[in-house]
Amino acid sequence: KESCDVQLYIKRQSEHSILAGDPFELECPVKYCANRPHVTWCKLNGTTCVKLEDRQTSWKEEKNISFFILHFEPVLPNDNGSYRCSANFQSNLIESHSTTLYVTDVKSASERPSKDEMASRPWLLYR
């Protein structure tokens, strides 16, 4: 008989090497039975995990598993670090292993900004 506990299938010490400026999806594989749990992402800062409140997330449902996705539009150098997803299920908090993003910044900070960047700097966003 299959367990009906919520399970988060992030492998221990999983990591992703990605380029700054590209889109990226960080997936938290979630197994549940009847009711989909409330899942959140957080980023590790020392011993605490800071909840990512204002970030785009979405659910992708597949036959035997669901994915809670954290979207990066785009990946930025300061997205480098370790992330964890956690699920609230029947008053229990279930935490995943952490997964680490290694962000390579191909456009070094010493590079001269492009005309687009200079023209639009007042409206440039950062996180």
């Epitope: 400026g21 590209d22 785009q56 979405s58 996705i69 300061n78 700097r121």
Partner: antibody, heavy 125, light 108 residues
Amino acid sequence: EVQLVQSGGGLVHPGGSLRLSCAGSGFTFSSYAMHWVRQAPGKGLEWVSVIGPGGGTYYADSVKGRFTISRDNAKNSLYLQMNSLRAEDMAVYFCARGYYYGSGNFFKNYGMDVWGQGTTVTVSS
Amino acid sequence: EIVLTQSPGTLSLSPGERATLSCRASQSVSSSYLAWYQQKPGQAPRLLIYGASSRATGIPDRFSGSGSGTDFTLTISRLEPEDFAVYYCQQYGGSPYTFGQGTKLQIK
């Protein structure tokens, strides 16, 4: 003037291949994510694929494994290689400019703010 | 994926009237990543609103966007003859970058 000019549509048999091109001008092409969006006759808009400034890609499930998005920043060009074409791929295909990534942690994401004129892909036996 | 549902499917109004178009998401969308487009027959879509409420360059101030979470609205305060077209909402916060099915705004 900021613009995207498309080429490469046409008639192809089911199972055939086609390559679409999109040339950008008037902006720093290499700093922008680029998208392909399609519109079947009389239907709404459907997102197809995206490629980031660094070459990272994502695809709609309906085209995954059959379509390949690529870019040549030296030529300010975006491409969509379409293989194993099906009747349901018949549509007008648009290229569109996505978010801007500068350097460090600066970016701007205004959605798809510049569009090509569209090119028609007809799949018929 | 995030499904966007637009209503009404067709809206019949006269020039000078106010148009209110709705877009509802199946999952929460960060308001930073909700856009509205206008499309006329035989033309490419044109960006009107990004970030749920910011007007794109060159868009007249009769167009405004609002909303957050799962409910978003595009309002055209006083319809001009050139505003009759199809309007699409889109979430662009991540793949797949879904569009609503469109609202056709037609002359009454």
